[in-house]
């Protein structure tokens, strides 16, 4: 259904091979990426509320597909926020976490409970924040607590964890 307005290969925005996206735009794509669909000549990337397409052979397209395949994009994306480094102390983090397999959590109550009760946390180096993750499944239930999304999805356990307890009083968490 390439070119179809309603199909998985409809494009909201086409990016020409001659003018690849900027670094800033790529970071935005990484953060909001939910899924991709391989079409005949191009790949369609589904974002939070819009879509963007690029040629199958374009390096940035290959990079984004690989990023989602490895779950380093989308809801899993942390991002490096340089201007927020002052929020965290300079003491080294204590490594204590493992990701949780929370993909089987579906109801809002369960998701909230899981996030609030979770004790398994990823170890993030100083200067990183783990909140404000994007969702990966369009049909997944979402609830918001203190302005942050709590979502279920592949490796959601990794992404909804709070920063370390010893990360400092000003470090934001994904559930308050």
């Amino acid at each position: 259904n390439e070119g179809s307005v309603t199909g998985s290969c409809y494009c909201g925005k086409r990016i020409s091979s001659d003018s690849p996206p900027s670094v800033q735009f790529m970071n935005r794509l990484r953060k909001h990426l939910r899924a991709y669909h391989r079409c005949l000549y191009y790949t369609r990337f589904q974002l939070l509320s819009w879509s963007v397409c690029g040629g199958n052979k374009d390096p940035w397209v290959q990079e984004l597909m690989s990023c989602l395949d490895l779950k380093e994009c989308g809801h899993a994306y942390s991002g490096i926020v340089a201007h927020q480094k002052h929020l965290l102390p300079t003491s080294p983090p204590i490594s204590q976490a493992s990701e949780g397999a929370s993909s089987d959590i579906h109801t809002p109550a369960q998701m909230l409970l899981s996030t609030l009760q979770s004790t398994q946390r990823p170890t993030l180096p100083v200067g990183s924040l783990s909140s404000d993750k994007e969702l990966t499944r369009p049909n997944e239930t979402t609830i918001h607590t203190a302005g942050h999304s709590l979502a279920a999805g592949p490796e959601a356990g990794e992404n909804q964890k709070q920063p370390e307890k010893n990360a400092g009083p000003t470090a934001r968490t994904s559930a308050t």
Epitope: L33, C67, D69, L70, S103, T123, E155
Partner: antibody
């Protein structure tokens, strides 16, 4: 060709420390999610640790059995990963494999043997 | 954690036979983001590291003979080895990489009848 070469294994006593390394080549290292997997003699495979890529702040994750004792780090400029193992226990005795998860598959090294014995 | 249940634990075969190894996961390994199944199959011979045969449940690693076929989706997966040869005698493991911690099946030992 893709290569992962582990080094640094050896015989240590319980409660001692050891740092093992893995040198990678033949693929875009900075884009790979790196893991350590171990295999005790005559046993199955057990995941040990994972480190994410730079855009995700090199976040690390550990198996419950090693949490608080092992530290995983990477150096993208050298295409190297390291596993610092402290307070070693006899049950940590195993062949330790470095693995690289890429979209083209999961690559494994030949392993380095860590023996913890008094 | 996702539990991987592999069967049978051992299998005695004759050269030329076709064998099937099953792997079942406690939850779906199909990721909606890319419609890929996060399952791999490995072959391990004594004294060697595991060798990747299949990834994304059905994609054969380069250099792996086409007699190795991976199939299945969701929670049920199969490794089929057609016309088994002597060099195929080894332990075979399935592994999920859908979620951390990665988990492995208990292994299937392929022996000569």
């Amino acid at each position: 060709a893709v290569q992962l070469v582990e080094s640094g294994g050896g015989l240590v006593q319980p409660k001692e420390s050891l740092k093992i390394s893995c040198a990678a080549s033949g693929f875009t290292f900075s884009n790979a999610v790196m893991n350590w997997v171990r295999q005790a003699p005559g046993k199955g495979l057990e995941w040990v640790a994972r480190i994410r890529t730079k855009p995700n702040n090199y976040a690390t994750f550990y198996a419950d059995s090693v949490k608080g004792r092992f530290t995983f780090s990477r150096d993208d400029s050298k295409s190297m990963v390291y596993l610092q193992m402290d307070n070693l226990k006899t049950e940590d005795t195993a062949m330790y494999y470095c693995t690289a998860w890429t979209t083209e598959g999961i690559y494994w090294g030949q392993g380095t043997l860590v023996t913890v014995s008094s | 954690d996702i539990v991987m249940t592999q069967s049978p634990s051992s299998l005695a075969v004759s050269a030329g036979e076709t064998v099937t190894i099953n792997c079942k996961s406690s939850q779906s390994l199909l990721y909606s983001g890319n419609q890929k199944n996060y399952l791999a199959w490995y072959q391990q011979k004594p004294g060697q590291s595991p060798k990747l045969l299949i990834y994304w449940a059905s994609t054969r690693q380069s250099g792996v003979p086409d007699r190795f076929i991976g199939s299945g989706s969701g929670t049920d997966f199969t490794l089929t080895i057609s016309s088994v040869q002597a060099e195929d005698l080894a332990i075979y493991y399935c592994q999920q990489y859908y979620d951390t911690p990665w988990t492995f099946g208990g292994g299937t030992k392929l022996e000569l009848k």
